[in-house]
Interface confidence: low
């Protein structure tokens, strides 16, 4: 932050945020803030890594190639084209101009957000962006908007990153085809840090009798505005491949009910390759409270997508017009059609026809909830809270907000305190059956609405037309997995701030990783679920998984995991440890055997003890060191990255439309 450029009110705001005196002349305020910033500056030795996510390196502009690579190994290696990381929005400004800082803890906030003042109906005043000021997500209110720009949508202006120590550096490493999710997870787990427990999520005083976007029934990477009627997904790096969904807080099971959704902006995702199918798309509709956020991809989940298709249970059919930025979709549920419920949609007031007919008997009296699923689009709802509808509403239909409270059904309400929340940390080698257990456990405890945090779950959100991106993915599969791992790191950070139930579906075999990952969830019921099958079963499962998914984790990585496998114990960061297959005693024996096997196999073939520094801050510019965390580089330079933050070209290839 350049203190000299801040206006008096901005200086005061920054000081107030830090609990400092806000009185005095501009020069005094600037001096006070500068001193505070210097005090906050991390030491040179502080490790910045994937979990810290300091935003985008200062020298990088989305359209400028990287300069100044690593001097360590040959020439500079910029990240593959199109995947330069960019700063994530610090938060989302609601009508009162405050930010809901959902996703970043103050300690890690390397950039400051400024509120844009609304200038007129059709646009916003912009401050000039300088090279080092990286642009965060900002809905660009275009002048051709059919409706006036909604006043509630005042996003952050830009992210101004701290200079120094943010050179984007990279190292070459041999390309390895078979790097799957387990591999990147393994590299991630070998690093050690002790993040601070996150700040508590802001508890807004929000009138719960209003129909709103439900902050509990939405994806972690879907950011809800303070007014709870608009939101947007994270779009940085790998998040741009992800669908992000949210449901409304209330549903209906009778009457003729409607709501509207407006696409406020298609958020710029220049880091996506041009081959990515439908980089901007919204799916809107209705689903049951028990459904996942992947609208239209399971039974009782009904969506109309921007590609003009309707879908339920992942069956996609041509239906209506395509829709995009600035379009308004009206969603209508008619429960007064005899034995059926009819769902239909309008685009900008024009009726698209009946999309779905659902037998009331099949619904079994369950309520349907407004639901949106977005990819790189900011959306706004009208549940009836606006004085006027955006567009024509079908005669005889009532906005859901206008129904009496007794006619609306509240969706599942989340836990009130962290003490009511569970985090189940899976522990087990690749292919042990962690994901299988996690999915089954979540399904058999629907009331807990477990959020599964794992690369597998993230890959599930990277679907195209309801299909997972398979190994025949046109871009580099390992890069996609890598991006999923980055997303996961960020989601874990966000998760620790939200009162929900989680299953952390990773290998978590390193003792250090177990501690590090559980620490931010202080206050939760923290449990480890150890899945340790017999060695024979593990081998069978590994073969089965290799047959189904391709080789996921290189043998040397599995051996290193075996060498370092530590069974967790109840203690300062775990309240309970459950063994699912082999019980403690047998598991202990097997793990000792694995430790021995792994140690005998020796270090992995590449750079195990390469303790040279360099490589920018961890994981940003690229390859960096592949060394054990105990062997740190010299104080002068941060350790190399665990993964190439810049990623590869990703992107679509041979898929049907979105």
């Amino acid at each position: 932050m350049d203190v000299r450029r801040l206006k008096v009110n901005e200086l005061r705001e920054e000081l107030q945020r830090r609990g400092l005196d806000t009185r005095g002349l501009k020069a005094e305020l600037a001096e006070r803030l500068q001193a505070a910033l210097e005090a906050e500056e991390p030491d040179d030795e502080r490790e910045l890594d994937a979990d810290d996510e300091p935003g985008r390196p200062g020298h990088i502009n989305e359209e400028v190639e990287t300069e100044g690579g690593s001097e360590l190994e040959g020439t500079a290696q910029p990240p593959p084209p199109g995947l330069q990381p960019h700063a994530e929005p610090g938060g989302y400004s609601g009508p009162d101009g405050h930010y809901a800082m959902d996703n970043i803890t103050r300690q890690n906030q390397f950039y400051d957000t400024q509120v844009i003042k609304q200038e007129n109906e059709s646009g916003y005043e912009r401050r000039p962006l300088e090279m080092e000021q990286q642009q965060a997500y900002r809905p660009e209110m275009k002048t051709e908007m059919k409706q006036g720009a909604p006043t509630s949508f005042l996003p952050p202006e830009a992210s101004q990153l701290k200079p120094d120590r943010q050179q984007f550096q990279s190292r070459k490493r041999p390309y390895e085809e078979n790097r799957g999710r387990g591999y990147f997870e393994h590299r991630e787990d070998r690093r050690g840090r002790s993040p601070q427990p996150p700040a508590e999520e802001d508890e807004d005083d929000f009138d719960d009798t209003l129909v709103a976007i439900d902050t509990y029934n939405c994806d972690l990477h879907f950011k809800v505005a303070r007014d709870r009627s608009s939101g947007y997904p994270l779009t940085i790096e790998g998040f741009a491949y992800l669908w992000s969904g949210a449901r409304a807080s209330y549903g209906v099971r009778r009457g003729r009910v409607c709501f509207e959704m407006k696409i406020n902006e298609e958020i710029s995702v220049k880091h996506l390759p041009s081959t990515e199918p439908d980089p901007h798309v919204v799916r809107i509709g209705w689903s049951l409270d028990s459904c996942s956020t992947q609208l239209g991809e399971e039974p009782f989940s009904y969506g109309y997508g921007g590609t003009g298709k309707k879908s339920t249970n992942s069956r996609f059919e041509n239906y209506g017009d395509k829709f995009a930025e600035n379009d308004v979709i009206g969603c209508f549920a008619d429960f007064e059609c005899g034995n059926d419920v009819e769902l239909s949609f309008t685009k900008n007031g024009k009726w698209m026809g009946i999309a779905f007919r659902i037998q009331k008997e099949a619904l079994g009296g369950q309520a349907l909830y407004p639901h949106v699923l977005v990819k790189n689009c900011a959306v706004e709802f009208n549940f009836g809270q606006r004085a006027e509808p955006y567009c024509s509403v079908l005669p005889g239909f009532t906005f859901i907000q206008h129904l009496p409270l007794s006619e609306r059904i509240r969706g599942t309400v989340g836990p009130k305190s962290k003490a009511e929340c569970e985090i189940l940390m899976m522990v087990g080698l690749p292919a042990a059956g962690k994901t299988t257990w996690a999915i089954k456990h979540a399904a058999s405890n629907p009331s807990k609405k477990y959020n599964i945090l794992g690369t597998n779950a993230i890959m599930d959100k990277m679907r195209v037309m309801g299909l997972r991106r398979q190994r025949n993915y046109a871009g580099r599969w390992d890069v996609l997995i890598q991006q999923a791992t980055q997303c996961l790191n960020r989601l874990i950070q966000i998760a620790a701030r939200k009162k929900r139930n989680y299953i952390l579906d990773q290998t978590n075999v390193y003792g250090s990783a177990q501690r590090r990952k559980m620490r931010p969830f202080e206050g939760f019921q923290r449990k480890a679920i150890v899945i340790c099958p017999t060695d024979e079963d593990l081998k069978d499962r590994t073969i089965k998984r290799t047959d189904e998914e391709g080789k996921d984790v290189p043998d040397h990585a599995v051996l290193e995991m075996k060498a370092n496998f530590t069974l967790p114990d109840v203690g300062d960061f775990l309240d309970e440890v459950l063994f699912i297959e082999l019980q403690r005693e047998e598991a202990d024996k097997l793990v000792r055997q694995y430790n021995e096997e792994g140690r005998k196999a020796g270090p992995p073939p590449e750079k195990r003890f390469d303790n040279r520094g360099g490589g920018g801050f961890r994981g940003r510019g690229g390859g960096g060191g592949f060394q054990r965390y105990e062997n740190r580089g010299p104080p002068g330079g941060n350790r190399g990255g665990f993964q190439n933050r810049g990623g590869g070209s990703g992107g679509g290839g041979n898929y049907r439309g979105g």
């Epitope: 059919k146 005899g338 007031g349 009726w351 567009c391």
Partner: antibody, heavy 116, light 107 residues
Amino acid sequence: QLQESGPELVKPGASVKISCKASGYSFTDYIILWVKQSHGKSLEWIGNINPYYGSTTYNLKFKGKATLTVDKSSSTAYMQLNSLTSEDSAVYYCARGDLTGTFAYWGQGTLVTVSA
Amino acid sequence: DIVMTQTPKFMSTSVGDRVSVTCKASQNVGTYVAWYQQKPGQSPKELIYSASYRYSGVPDRFTGSGSGTDFTLTISNVQSEDLAEYFCQQFNSYPLTFGAGTKLELQ
């Protein structure tokens, strides 16, 4: 596409049934509206029918005068006009409607002439 | 019933001109207004729905505006093929009602 039946010349007091055959889309997914246009005059909405259920909505002015029906098997909508008088001489249009009540696609119209 | 009062009844124009037709609803109809064009011997064709949205395939010289009770259809750069009768319609509530029409003629 909506194809209406040909012109009708009928005597006062008689009835007439005009048809509107839909093609090129799913007939049961869109309502059919009927509109009257007297010579040199404006348009008057008669009513709609939802082909899926056969449910109807009428303009009170035409209740008893017009009866709307559909035959799903042939994707055809019908309007019967009863107790005809010279006032009923007009062009009658069927249109594929939106639930919103706008008329997206129109038939070519059927001229009904009531004359002794 | 909602009455839609359309003015003028007739309008003379030349190719290239800009013309406006207005429609006044007897009560607030929000933006629930459509405009239709009817050429002699043909059935009507929808131009505008929801007050300001052009139906697909409609040239952008046709624009609709207004909300509440006052609505306008504007044709900028009139072409000879635009000579027709224009009707407004409200679909805020049943019964659906139309304006009396405006005939656009060449001077």
